[in-house]
């Protein structure tokens, strides 16, 4: 069977401070059932960057409309980038669990580097 793949096509993205960064992610399947989230960093100390279902992420917008049916594009855009945003960002598929969802598969990561604002 073709198991779901998480595709982050860019290994790295470089953005000038103050601009927006687009981080691309696509899935090859709608299953297993469960949400997709974005994190910065890996392991226990990773930072949640975007979760559609809960939380408030004012600088993050989704590239595809949130009412799009059977969406396989989970790319995001982060506005007003600062040097503090530098790091490696992971798109992660979770498998629905009870009571908690379980991490199923992660993308390879996209390293965001921040250039100085052009003068």
């Amino acid at each position: 069977e073709d198991e779901l793949q998480v595709i982050q096509p860019e290994k790295s993205v470089s953005v000038a401070a103050g601009e927006s960064a687009t981080l691309r992610c696509a899935m090859t399947s709608l299953i297993p059932v469960g949400p997709i989230m974005w994190f910065r960093g890996a392991g226990a100390g990773r930072e949640l960057i975007y979760n559609q279902k809960e939380g408030h992420f004012p600088r993050v917008t989704t590239v595809s409309e949130l009412t799009k049916r059977n969406n396989l594009d989970f790319s995001i855009s982060i506005s007003n980038i600062t040097p503090a945003d530098a790091g490696t960002y992971y798109c992660v598929k979770f498998r629905k669990g009870s009571p908690d969802d379980v991490e199923f598969k992660s993308g390879a990561g996209t390293e965001l580097s921040v250039r100085a604002k052009p003068s």
Epitope: E1, L30, I31, P32, G34, I36, N70, N71
Partner: antibody
Framework: EVQLVESGGGVVQPGGSLRLSCAAS????????MSWVRQAPGKGLEWVST??????YYADSVKGRFTISRDNSKNTLYLQMNSLRAEDTAVYYC???????????????WGQGTLVTVSS | EIVLTQSPATLSVSPGERVTFSCRAS??????IAWYQQKPGQAPRLLIY???SRDTGIPDRFSGSGSGTDFTLTISSLQSEDFGVYYC??????????FGGGTKVEIK
């Protein structure tokens, strides 16, 4: 055109077993979750079970008695029903799940249903 | 388990009238509500998802609104083919997916 065709319903005694099938066509079956929803005579809709890849989910009322499965090579969804009870009497619908946004499922296509009657 | 309460249970309406159905959730379901129409002897048919998005091919006389716990399905001008039972369903928190008890629309 999406088509879902259920089969396997019938009359069975309490404690008996039945296996329902749902033949799917017109869409990429293997990448979608699929579900069974039932409707007792004259009653409302009740979700029974959903399958993703190998991830399965059940209503408490059928847990341990019903098993959902799929064969992607045959584009077919199954529901194995054991230890049937009178309260399982219903029309059983096969439904294709649709997602919206980044999670959340509803049912965008339904089969015509197959009637299961549990009676002695 | 999230309980969905639909009201009224039955509506008797004349063609051309505006019809409003209510669906109330026992807790916040954001906008994760779908609406279905079921005619006698037929399978349910998806009308609305994400509280207000019409499914492909659904006439624009059908509209949905609401978020949180209170949702409404409106038929702006009822046609004779709109008789049947209308169900709401939540998909915010599952299992289980839950449906409302339905509102039956009878043609006057």
């Amino acid at each position: 055109e999406v088509q879902l065709v259920e089969s396997g319903g019938g009359v069975v005694q309490p404690g008996g077993s039945l296996r329902l099938s749902c033949a799917a066509s017109g869409f990429s079956f293997s990448i979608y979750a699929m579900s069974w929803v039932r409707q007792a005579p004259g009653k409302g809709l009740e979700w029974v079970s959903t399958i993703g890849a190998d991830d399965t989910y059940y209503a408490d009322s059928v847990k341990g008695r019903f098993t959902i499965s799929r064969d992607n090579s045959k584009n077919t969804l199954y529901l194995q029903m054991n230890s049937l009870r009178a309260e399982d009497t219903a029309v059983y619908y096969c439904a294709k799940d649709s997602t919206v946004g980044w999670s959340g499922d509803f049912f965008d296509y339904w089969g015509q249903g197959t009637l299961v009657t549990v009676s002695s | 388990e999230i309980v969905l309460t639909q009201s009224p249970a039955t509506l008797s309406v004349s063609p051309g009238e505006r019809v409003t159905f209510s669906c109330r959730a026992s807790q916040n379901v954001r906008s994760d509500i779908a609406w279905y129409q079921q005619k006698p002897g037929q399978a349910p048919r998806l009308l609305i998802y994400a509280a207000s998005s019409r499914d492909t091919g659904i006439p624009d006389r059908f509209s949905g609104s609401g978020s949180g716990t209170d949702f409404t399905l409106t038929i702006s001008s009822l046609q004779s083919e709109d008789f049947g039972v209308y169900y709401c369903q939540q998909y915010y928190d599952w299992p289980p997916f839950t449906f409302g008890g339905g509102t039956k629309v009878e043609i006057k």
